[in-house]
């Protein structure tokens, strides 16, 4: 039976231009992460494999940085990374944990003056 | 198998700078955070800070921004430490220490600086 | 930054004996803290990693709980092989941090 929970960052906002940490934690459950999967939508951004390390695609390799620890830090936000993100957290023996976090990247001055999302 | 190669001991005098260097092997450089701790005499440990060799990012622990700086080179898979306008209290051991899905499961024996005139 | 504090700074115990060491931190790190041991002359070695995720080649008498900002370290049974220095380190956020450790000594 599968008893972790994946705890994200939620909905979160960032300026454009700028840097955003996305975040998932895996609790409740002793089962062993092999890999963690970061992915846009249905596009691959980046992979932490216990034996082999991190994999960035190619092409986000220029703008995705691996960390802090499972994380996964976008640099240099532009309008178009607005939308969901999700973190797959491969385990033994529980299977497959999926977590979401939304990201809006607004202009700099809607930004400064209150974004619809806060990091919780 | 994974190794992490530091050099015994570095002996330099009061102001000058050192290159303490770390070479890995065993694994794809690339793919794995590289980090730095520091450990004087009898205390405890240190961050200073990382790299990922994949892309020359760094981070720093804010106390070392100004004394050390972070480098690679992914053709012989070594990792860098530049230490500078050195004093006493860089004198400590200094390792090296990987990281992937976690933290730090291989370390070097460490480089011993020793600051003196 | 986040800061962990151990507890005790020093331990005198006796081969046999089973012992909790303390490690708080200063904020939620929420399961991103790991244990290491540091014998004399030696360099650190992973015991732990996320809490309590036991690490290949380490006995089974050292096991960790806690979660949020309160964690722990249990050593059943204490072999004179496990008397050192222990850390507790977050990989939370950065700038990593380690705490002060704590030194279990033989009684």
């Known amino acids: 039976m599968m008893t972790g929970t994946i705890e994200t960052t939620g909905n979160i906002s960032a300026e454009k231009g700028g840097s955003i940490i996305l975040q998932c934690h895996l609790s409740s459950t002793t089962a062993q992460v092999t890999q963690v999967n970061w992915e846009q939508q249905d596009q691959l951004l980046a992979i932490c494999n216990a034996d082999l390390g991190w994999h960035i695609s190619p092409s986000f390799k220029d703008r995705v940085a691996p960390g802090p620890g499972l994380g996964l830090t976008l640099q240099s936000l532009t309008v178009n990374d607005t939308g969901e993100y999700f973190c797959i957290y491969h385990t033994y023996p529980d299977g497959t944990y999926t977590g979401r976090i939304f990201l809006e990247v607004l202009e700099s001055s809607v930004a400064e003056h209150g974004a619809r999302f806060q990091i919780p | 198998q994974v190794q992490l190669q530091q050099p015994g001991s570095e002996l330099v005098r009061p102001g000058a700078s050192v290159k303490l260097s770390c070479k890995a092997s065993?694994?794809?450089?690339?793919?794995?955070?590289m980090h730095w701790v520091k450990q004087r005499h009898g205390q405890g440990l240190e961050w200073i800070g990382n790299i990922y060799p994949g892309s020359g990012t760094t981070n720093y622990d804010e106390k070392f921004k100004n004394k050390g700086t972070l480098t690679v080179d992914t053709s012989s898979s070594t990792a860098y430490i530049h230490l500078s306008s050195l004093t006493s209290e860089d004198s400590a051991v200094y390792y090296c220490?990987?990281?992937?899905?976690?933290?730090?499961?291989?370390w070097g024996q460490g480089t011993t600086l020793t600051v003196s005139s | 930054d986040i800061v962990l504090t151990q507890s005790p700074a020093t331990l005198s115990v006796t081969p046999g004996d089973s012992v909790s060491l303390s490690c708080r931190a200063s904020q939620s790190i929420r399961n991103n803290l790991h244990w290491f041991q540091q014998k004399s002359h030696e360099s650190p070695r992973l015991l732990i990693k996320y809490v309590f995720q036991s690490i290949s080649g380490i006995p089974s008498r050292f096991s960790g709980s806690g979660s949020g900002t309160d964690f722990t370290l249990s050593i059943n049974s204490l072999e004179t092989e496990d008397f050192g220095m222990y850390f507790c380190q977050q990989s939370n956020s950065w700038p990593y941090t380690f705490g002060g450790g704590t030194k279990l000594e033989i009684k």
């Open positions: 220490t990987r990281e992937g899905l976690y933290p730090f499961d291989y």
């Open positions: 065993g694994y794809t450089f690339t793919s794995y955070w």
